[in-house]
């Protein structure tokens, strides 16, 4: 029986041209985990696995960058990183968990209602 | 200024599909998401989820995967909502609500349509 | 999912009065970065509902400044200071900080 739990950064709101860290912790599990693949929507961003350590998809190599831990590193943010991540946990025995993040990247100029943007 | 202007009331029978629109004006229609509510029996309210017009990007609610598809079409601003394989479950007041920059929050809402399954 | 509870669920209350609806989530909604992605509602009958607050505290455009809203974590409060008839309708409190996002299952604030 799966009784693990994902917990995530939460939303992010950040501005073009910062960066930004996501994150996520599986819990209450003492499953194993064995590899942590990152995706947005349906592109593999990274992969961090228990035995090879990581991969980074070449298409992000740039803006992408491992850790901390188990997280990603977004980096140079562009309106069109705004959307929806996914941290997939692989585990054994229990199998798949799934935690989800939304990112919005805003215009630096957008510093709307006084907005208190996300730049580490 | 901003408004969302939704598509009528509809009576729909159950197993149909109906699609939604929410045309929007007054603003930069691109640059912000348009999220999706559900009110069911005039009470409470639920997050359907959000498309942003962008990129295309969305996120729902898994509640309402496979039962809600949203997409956009940039040359009219306009948003639509498709529900699948209609039930009673699914008679509710559904909203287009434009997102808040920076906050996650909802702004500016449609007037709502009405959604009502019978046969 | 967050789980999102108000209370109470019906507050009658006299055109002058102070009130106060309370929000509580089951899991802290303060993001990695120390935002907190709450905000409130008002739905009056017959209209769309309108954003009241946001970012917990945060007063929206044309919002009268009757209307506060305060807390962290996991706790929140909306405070309307002099109660008057355009006030009266349900109020929601929705979470943004975790997907899905969720509301508060609405408080009727209604005459006495």
């Known amino acids: 029986m799966m009784t693990g739990t994902i917990e995530t950064t939460g939303n992010i709101s950040a501005e073009k041209g910062g960066s930004i860290i996501l994150q996520c912790h599986l819990s209450s599990t003492t499953a194993q985990v064995t590899q942590v693949n990152w995706e947005q929507q349906d592109q593999l961003l990274a992969i961090c696995n228990a035995d090879l350590g990581w991969h980074i998809s070449p298409s992000f190599k740039d803006r992408v960058a491992p850790g901390p831990g188990l997280g990603l590193t977004l980096q140079s943010l562009t309106v069109n990183d705004t959307g929806e991540y996914f941290c997939i946990y692989h585990t054994y025995p229990d199998g798949t968990y799934t935690g989800r993040i939304f990112l919005e990247v805003l215009e630096s100029s957008v510093a709307e209602h006084g907005a208190r943007f996300q730049i580490p | 200024e901003v408004q969302l202007q939704q598509s009528g009331p509809e009576l729909v029978k159950p197993g149909a599909s109906l699609k939604i629109s929410c045309k929007a004006s007054g603003y930069s229609f691109t640059g912000y998401t348009m999220n999706w509510v559900k009110q069911s029996h005039g009470k409470n309210l639920e997050w359907i989820g959000l498309i942003f017009p962008y990129n295309g990007a969305t996120s729902y609610n898994q509640k309402f995967q496979g039962k809600a598809t949203l997409t956009v079409d940039k040359s009219s601003n306009t948003t639509y909502m498709e529900l699948l394989s209609l039930t009673s479950e699914d008679s509710a007041v559904y909203y287009c609500?434009?997102?808040?920059?920076?906050?996650?929050?909802?702004?500016?809402w449609g007037q709502g349509t009405s959604v009502t399954v019978s046969s | 999912d967050v789980v999102v509870t108000q209370t109470p669920l019906s507050l009658p209350v006299s055109f002058g009065d102070q009130v106060s609806i309370s929000c509580r989530s089951s899991q802290s909604l303060a993001n990695s970065y120390g935002n907190t992605y709450l905000s409130w509602y008002l739905h009056k009958p017959g209209q769309s509902p309108q954003l009241l607050i946001y970012?917990?505290?945060n007063r929206f455009s044309g919002v009268p400044d009757r209307f506060s809203g305060s807390g962290s974590g996991t706790d929140f409060t909306l405070t309307i200071s002099t109660i008057k008839p355009e006030d009266l309708g349900m109020y929601y409190c929705?979470?943004?900080?975790?997907?899905?996002?969720?509301f508060g299952g609405g408080t009727k604030l209604e005459i006495k």
């Open positions: 929705l979470q943004g900080t975790h997907l899905p996002w969720t």
């Open positions: 609500t434009r997102g808040l920059r920076g906050y996650f929050a909802l702004d500016y």
């Open positions: 970012g917990i505290s």
